[in-house]
Interface confidence: low
């Protein structure tokens, strides 16, 4: 048993032209998170199963808002490691898929929206208990820098975490620098020390004093890339020190094959033999399949199970995107009519209707005056989603039930005196003024 640990160092625009804009904007701040999927790399059977070694999701990173006019920087990352515990032996060779996701934090109803920004994949050789391995992967115009390692959980030890050690009851009986280990209670085992000078990045050992190389490296100390090892190629000038032919620049130098592909020279150029799940001239394209579980939010994956088959996600209601990763803002289509308020509940859409309207989409205009009577000879006037009474003279209020004092509003101008009358009001004007309201 043990833990695979992934540390993301940076995610941002890669070098060269065509650098992408920031995925966040001033109008739509966002934050990043990461998903890692691990599969044993050499097992045909396991390659079919989704994330057979395990998967992990990072925490959300800090919220980021783009500064207008500024170049897209490396984006703020979530804290901490992504940890994928494994219960059985560590396989040594494994495949990984690392996805960078964006969570948009706009004010959309129904919560945040997710979208896949980048996906990188590869196959690597890694011994448990070794140092951190660093890697850089590019996906389109994005660049992801990360480190990873596999470590055993006590009492497991070894490059595959298959040997069991336990603390001895009397560790002092071992010499300094020796660690207690069971097969036998009294046996002490020296810590594993590789051959002096063995490359910590490209070499590892399973026995003391040896130096075994990771894929793509050679030499007694694993410091020589396979494609530039001397005496392997008949090309180039002779070396004075070894008498071997030193390779000149060849099509496989620098290994143009991505994602763990192996390069072989051809008469005209080079050819990449791609690991399972990758294709393209340089193994640059990941053939993600339904077995990798690429459809989120309950999406149905359709496509062949073999890595050469493309897949397509059929999304459930409320989700869209190639991986069903985006929540559809169904309210943006303004389905509620007559000024109704739209509520996306996820499983359903609801419209909260204004007064005077009804129906699933507020499409029915109610008869505002139905069943509403205006008292004292008032008449009902419909409109604006509410009823209104036009009251007879001398009455007021919502339903014309209140007796109105026609003089309350002081209708007589220029100091005229107001008298209430059964037919309305009468103004007695001050000297020098005339008219129904003493306005002249």
């Amino acid at each position: 048993a043990g833990v695979f640990e992934l540390q993301i160092h940076s995610f941002g625009p890669g070098p060269g032209p065509g650098a992408p804009r920031s995925p966040c904007s001033a109008r739509l701040p966002c934050r990043l998170f990461f998903r890692v999927c691990l599969k044993p790399g050499l097992s045909e059977e396991a390659a079919e199963s989704p994330c057979a070694l395990g998967a992990a999701l990072s925490a959300r990173g800090p919220v980021y808002t783009e500064q207008p006019g500024a170049p897209a920087p490396d984006l703020p990352l979530p804290d901490g490691l992504l940890q994928v515990p494994f219960r059985d032996a560590w396989p040594g060779t494994f495949s990984f898929i690392i996805e960078t996701w964006r969570e948009e934090l706009g004010d959309q109803i129904g919560g945040p929206a997710w979208s896949l920004l980048a996906r990188v994949a590869g196959r690597r050789r890694l011994a448990a208990g070794g140092p951190w391995a660093r890697d850089i992967q590019r996906a389109g115009a994005w660049e992801l820098r990360f480190s990873y390692r596999a470590r055993c959980e006590p009492p497991a030890v070894g490059t595959a975490c298959t040997r069991l050690c336990r603390p001895r009851s009397a560790p002092s009986r071992c010499g300094p620098g020796l660690r207690p280990c069971a097969p036998l209670e009294d046996e002490c085992e020296a810590p594993l020390v590789c051959r002096a000078g063995c490359s910590p990045e490209h070499g590892f050992c399973e026995q003391p004093g040896e130096c075994r190389c990771l894929e793509g490296w050679t030499g007694p100390l694993c410091t020589v890339p396979v494609s530039t090892s001397s005496c392997l190629s008949p090309r180039g000038p002779s070396s004075a020190t070894t008498g071997c032919l030193v390779p000149g620049p060849g099509p496989c130098d620098g290994n143009p094959c991505a994602n763990g592909g192996s390069c072989s020279e051809t008469p005209r150029s080079f050819e990449c033999t791609c690991p399972r799940g990758f294709y393209g001239l340089r193994c640059e394209v990941s053939g993600v399949t339904c077995a990798d579980g690429p459809c989120f939010n309950g999406g149905l994956c359709v496509g062949g199970a073999d890595p050469d088959s493309a897949y397509i996600c059929h999304c459930p209601p409320g989700f869209q995107g190639s991986n069903c990763e985006k929540r559809v803002d169904r309210c943006s289509l303004q389905p509620c009519r007559n000024g109704g308020l739209c509520l996306d509940l996820g499983h359903a859409l609801r419209c909260r209707c204004r007064a005077g309207f009804a129906g699933p989409r507020c499409e029915h205009d109610l008869d505002d005056c139905a069943g509403r009577a205006c008292a004292n000879g008032g008449t009902c006037v419909e409109g604006g989603g509410a009823h209104r009474c036009s009251c007879a003279l001398g009455f007021g209020g919502r339903d014309c039930r209140e007796r109105a004092d026609p003089c309350a509003a002081r209708p007589c101008a220029h100091g005229g005196r107001c008298y209430a009358h059964f037919s309305g009001l009468v103004c007695a004007c001050a000297p020098g003024y005339m008219g129904a309201r003493c306005e002249f």
Epitope: L117, A118, A139, G280, A310
Partner: nanobody, 117 residues
Framework: QVQLVESGGGSVQAGGSLRLSCAAS???????MAWYRQAPGKERELVSR???????NYAASVKGRFTISQDNAKNTVYLQMNSLNPGDTGMYYC????????????WGNGILVTVSS
């Protein structure tokens, strides 16, 4: 919106030939195009794929008989099918993988190929 228009299907006698075409539009960042087929009652399977850079691969059952090619100027992929046999009968679907991360997949509506003995 990505659109794929297939043509060239039909009926042919065993040993005959057909040439399928698939014209694509409405996309950016193409990674590859492919032909799949689905025989009645069977799973959809890859026939052949061609990446933008010209890398091709074929199902074992069609190697040596089918040839995939592309015209990048016309955004069209072709499948030349020779020495057809009844086992090649089925619906043939054009597919395209696009996007910066090669993760967006689109399918055509399919075209019927019938090979009679």
């Amino acid at each position: 919106q990505v659109q794929l228009v297939e043509s060239g299907g039909g009926s042919v006698q065993a040993g005959g030939s057909l040439r399928l075409s698939c014209a694509a539009s409405g996309y950016t960042d193409r990674c590859s195009m492919a032909w799949y087929r689905q025989a009645p009652g069977k799973e959809r399977e890859l026939v052949s794929r061609i990446s933008t850079s010209g890398f091709t691969n074929y199902a074992a059952s069609v190697k040596g008989r089918f040839t995939i090619s592309q015209d990048n100027a016309k955004n069209t992929v072709y499948l030349q099918m020779n020495s057809l046999n009844p086992g090649d009968t089925g619906m043939y679907y054009c597919a395209i993988i696009v996007g910066r991360t090669c993760s967006l997949n689109y399918w055509g509506n399919g075209i019927l190929v019938t090979v009679s003995s």
